[in-house]
């Protein structure tokens, strides 16, 4: 006469996180009398998942009516699966006694949980960098399972190749994290550029997740300065302009110096934006040459985004102009509208 067998037909079952997992188990006999119990793992540290005889297991329901006479199906459904539920589940027949004794175990069913990766988070360097410099971007995504995952980097749709990726932990785990660092060389045209980290995983059904970083938060394009002199109708006045071109971000302070002495300081306000996202600004100084006996050295000094000042000077010749006593240097400024 054949002894009771515990049959777990599925060697493995894969379930998406949040769904229910059905673990199948049938027995071939009602003998001996005693409960079926389900465990996760084997050995002394195994975790009780369900006991037909007693206990409260809110996430577990029996697939067939376990109290039904002649029931030999002890399959269970575990609701709201999370990656922490992964493992091998054993259906075990116990023999009634004091205490109940283990009679026979099924071969086990390995439950793997498919968990979606979190939305990739891309972060750039703490400080801005200038064109021609190489900056690092990191991309992180967490909580996915199984471990296999693909990560790609793009800059404005072009795939990048200079990056390093790690998936942790290296060994078995209920869920995994990915960390990648990409190196990007900045150019002057990168104000409107985007760096994209793209993560593909079996749980995403071919629709990868993306994280983006705008290079506008990373790049600093230093301005170019040009100081020019334009005559005005009044023969004793000269208009000197300082063209500040192609800078980013907008934070900029300009100071005029006359022979090294501060004449006026102003902050860029009415700027014009170039197609590449950089800005232009123009400041002018109206110089009353009759107030000067000697040549004047005019300096346009620009402090951009907290960086050390850059300057451009212009020598103003005054020897040819008649001197008018009592005149002061006058200065007026309005925003310019030069676009490149």
């Amino acid at each position: 006469e054949e002894e009771l067998q515990v049959i777990q037909p599925d060697k493995s079952v894969s379930v998406a996180a949040g769904e229910s997992a059905i673990l199948h188990c049938t027995v071939t006999s009602l003998i001996p009398v005693g409960p079926i119990q389900w465990f996760r793992g084997a050995g002394p540290a195994r975790e009780l998942i369900y006991n037909q005889k007693e206990g409260h297991f809110p996430r577990v329901t029996t697939v067939s009516e376990s109290t039904k006479r002649e029931n030999m199906d002890f399959s269970i459904s575990i609701s709201n699966i999370t990656p922490a539920d992964a493992g091998t589940y054993y259906c075990v027949k116990f023999r009634k006694g004091s205490p109940d004794t283990e009679f026979k175990s099924g071969a086990g069913t390995e439950l793997s949980v498919r968990a979606k990766p979190s939305a990739p988070v891309v972060s750039g360097p703490a400080a801005r960098a200038t064109p021609q410099h190489t900056v690092s971007f990191t991309c992180e995504s967490h909580g996915f399972s199984p471990r296999d995952i693909t990560l790609k980097w793009f800059k404005n749709g072009n795939e990048l190749s200079d990056f390093q990726t790690n998936v942790d932990p290296v060994g078995e785990s209920v869920s995994y994290s990915i960390h990648s660092t990409a190196k990007v060389v900045l150019t002057r045209e990168d104000v409107h550029s985007q760096v994209i980290c793209e993560v593909a995983h079996v749980t995403l059904q071919g629709d990868p997740l993306r994280g983006t970083a705008n290079l506008s938060e990373t790049i600093r394009v230093p301005p170019t300065l040009e100081v020019t002199q334009q005559p005005v109708r009044a023969e004793n006045q000269v208009n000197v302009t300082c063209q500040v071109r192609k800078f980013y971000p907008q934070r900029l302070q300009l100071t005029w110096l006359e022979n090294g002495n501060v004449s006026r300081t102003e902050t860029a306000s009415t700027v014009t934006e170039n197609k590449d996202g950089t800005y232009n600004w123009m400041s002018w100084l109206l110089v009353n040459v009759s107030a000067h006996r000697d040549d004047v050295k005019l300096t346009c000094q620009v402090e951009h985004d907290g960086q050390p000042a850059v300057s451009k000077s212009h020598d103003l010749k005054v020897s040819a102009h008649p001197k008018e006593q009592g005149s002061n240097t006058a200065a007026e400024n309005t925003g310019s509208n030069e676009r490149n």
Partner: antibody, heavy 115, light 111 residues
Framework: RQLVESGGGLVQPGGSLRLSCAAS????????ISWVRQAPGKGLEYIGT?????ITYYASWAKGRFTGSKTSSTAYLQMTSLRAEDTAVYYC????????????WGQGTLVTVSS | DIVMTQSPSSLSASVGDRVTITCQAS????????LAWYQQKPGQAPKLLIY???TLATGVPSRFSGSGSGTDFTLTISSLQPEDFATYYC???????????FGQGTKVEIK
């Protein structure tokens, strides 16, 4: 689905008797067969259960004198050293108790122990 | 061994009456629910009514119900029918697989 007992009758004190319980409509392979007796005018008394080879058990008072066995179609109860107080109707029933209750019963066979 | 005490030992009732029979175990039954109820009519084999304390056996009318856990159990017949006059037995199981004991029976007679 039914169980049919046979083998009862008159036996002298100290004698032996073997009862049979034939199943029809189902196999005994995956079911226990339990034996219950009822003395005249008295209540029911559990004797024991025959499962598979190693899974056979008896009430404490029945150990030693009562032995069960079964094939896929017939269960047996061997009774020895019979006494007058063993006089009863003997029933076989399908089941082992708890979640496997005694759901099918034979019609019973009367065993009379008398000299 | 577990001892099952049924009460009352007999009762008289009329058709349509609600009848309650109790069964008390000397210790908690196995799994707190190893308790079955059987009906026996004269000259017949017992018939399973309820098992696992409250599960109605196949083909048994719904007027029969079982309740209880641990040591105290009840069989209720909500509206007694003429065919229900019989003797009722509880069968309790202790922790040992051979420890199965019937109560002494409750005879339900016509008033």
């Amino acid at each position: 689905r039914q169980l049919v007992e046979s083998g009862g009758g008159l036996v002298q004190p100290g004698g032996s008797l073997r009862l049979s319980c034939a199943a029809s409509g189902f196999s005994l392979s995956s079911h226990g067969i339990s034996w219950v007796r009822q003395a005249p005018g008295k209540g029911l008394e559990y004797i024991g259960t025959i499962g598979t080879g190693v899974i056979t058990y008896y009430a404490s008072w029945a150990k030693g004198r009562f032995t069960g066995s079964k094939t896929s179609s017939t269960a047996y109860l061997q009774m020895t050293s019979l006494r007058a107080e063993d006089t009863a109707v003997y029933y076989c029933a399908r089941g082992s108790a708890w979640n496997d209750p005694f759901d099918y019963w034979g019609q019973g066979t009367l065993v009379t122990v008398s000299s | 061994d577990i001892v099952m005490t049924q009460s009352p030992s007999s009762l008289s009732a009329s058709v349509g009456d609600r009848v309650t029979i109790t069964c008390q175990a000397s210790q908690s039954v196995y799994g707190n629910n190893d308790l079955a109820w059987y009906q026996q009519k004269p000259g017949q084999a017992p018939k399973l009514l309820i098992y696992l304390a409250s599960t109605l056996a196949t083909g048994v009318p719904s007027r029969f119900s079982g309740s209880g856990s641990g040591t105290d159990f009840t069989l209720t017949i909500s509206s007694l029918q003429p065919e229900d006059f019989a003797t009722y037995y509880c069968l309790g199981g202790g922790d040992d697989e051979a420890d199965n004991t019937f109560g002494q029976g409750t005879k339900v007679e016509i008033k």
